[in-house]
């Protein structure tokens, strides 16, 4: 019987080259929470283990800075990086919980005005 | 290994208390639930309830309130279960067992220790 | 509540026969939250299989689960002389998460 919610900072957009942080909280319920792992689309980027703590994704490991809490850092935004986002809560007794985060990665705005304005 | 280890066996007369004690070790106490589980003899399984180790809130199943006290001492990695005002039907088995998920389950369990009640 | 009905309550078989082992329940169980456990005498019950057909670690190839809903089977492939005990199912789809009443498996 599943009762908890999963709060998630939704739709969020960043500037290229930057850095953003996605972040999850499960509420209403009193199930104990065992890992969280954060995923983008069918890729793993990170778990936080109970037992083990965290563990970075090699492949992401330049770019993916654990926490703040059970959150997730993203640096060097690329807009590659624009996507679906999601959090999976794994929690004794009531199971997986999934919260679900849609990133959008924009040119800087400092690239945006040079384009717009040209000199002369 | 991860294991839970339960006291002794205890005898006691209606009326009284009984305190199980239920130590983990080879994993951190507070990384994981704990349940509480009886089996009466010859009788099958009987789910009591469980506490969050790291907020320390217990769940009670109907049937199990107001008598049973789940609490945890985190300093010495040990889950205790506190049984009040004694009755002849609380003799059994009790396990402590460690929630584990996703998908649920109990995949680790204590020995057992075994209430009698009897004057 | 959900009740789980398990059969047949005792199960006569030989060493190396197949034992199919059935448990029931009164409403469908949320994503087949179910788990199987062994017990033998004098000792506390063992993991088998939870999701209502995962292995669990260090359980025999020979041990299988599966089902779906209300109907979930136990299968043991073989049956070695250790595997004569009793079986319990238990369901973590609704609150309080009930057991059945267990299969005992007994050397015919």
């Known amino acids: 019987m599943m009762t908890g919610t999963i709060e998630t900072t939704g739709n969020i957009s960043a500037e290229k080259g930057g850095s953003i942080i996605l972040q999850c909280h499960l509420s209403s319920t009193t199930a104990q929470v065992t890992q969280v792992n954060w995923e983008q689309q069918d890729q793993l980027l990170a778990i936080c283990n109970a037992d083990l703590g965290w563990h970075i994704s090699p492949s992401f490991k330049d770019r993916v800075a654990p926490g703040p809490g059970l959150g997730l850092t993203l640096q060097s935004l690329t807009v590659n990086d624009t996507g679906e986002y999601f959090c999976i809560y794994h929690t004794y007794p009531d199971g997986t919980y999934t919260g679900r985060i849609f990133l959008e990665v924009l040119e800087s705005s400092v690239a945006e005005h040079g384009a717009r304005f040209q000199i002369p | 290994q991860v294991q839970l280890v339960q006291s002794g066996s205890e005898l006691k007369k209606p009326g009284a208390s009984v305190k199980v004690s239920c130590k983990a070790s080879g994993y951190t106490l507070t990384s994981h639930a704990l349940n509480w589980v009886r089996q009466a003899p010859g009788q099958g399984l009987e789910w009591m309830g469980w506490i969050n180790t790291n907020t320390g809130n217990p769940t009670y199943v109907q049937g199990f309130t107001g008598r049973f006290v789940f609490s945890l001492d985190t300093s010495v990695s040990t889950a205790y279960l506190q049984i009040s005002s004694l009755k002849a039907e609380d003799t059994a088995v009790y396990y402590c067992?460690?929630?584990?998920?996703?998908?649920?389950?109990?995949?680790?369990w204590g020995q057992g220790t075994t209430v009698t009640v009897s004057s | 509540e959900i009740v789980l009905t398990q059969s047949p309550g005792t199960l006569f078989l030989s060493p190396g026969e197949r034992a199919t082992l059935s448990c029931r329940a009164s409403?469908?169980?949320?994503?087949?939250?179910l788990v199987w456990y062994q017990q033998k005498p004098g000792q506390a019950p063992r993991l088998l299989i939870y999701g209502a057909s995962t292995r669990a670690t260090g359980i025999p190839d020979r041990f299988s689960g599966s089902g779906s809903g209300t109907d979930f089977t136990l299968t043991i492939r073989r049956l070695e002389p250790e595997d004569f005990a009793l079986y319990y199912c238990?369901?973590?789809?609704?609150?309080?998460?009930?057991f059945g009443q267990g299969t005992k498996l007994e050397i015919n």
């Open positions: 409403q469908s169980v949320s994503r087949n939250y």
């Open positions: 238990q369901q973590y789809g609704s609150s309080p998460f009930t």
């Open positions: 067992a460690r929630g584990y998920s996703s998908p649920p389950r109990m995949d680790v």
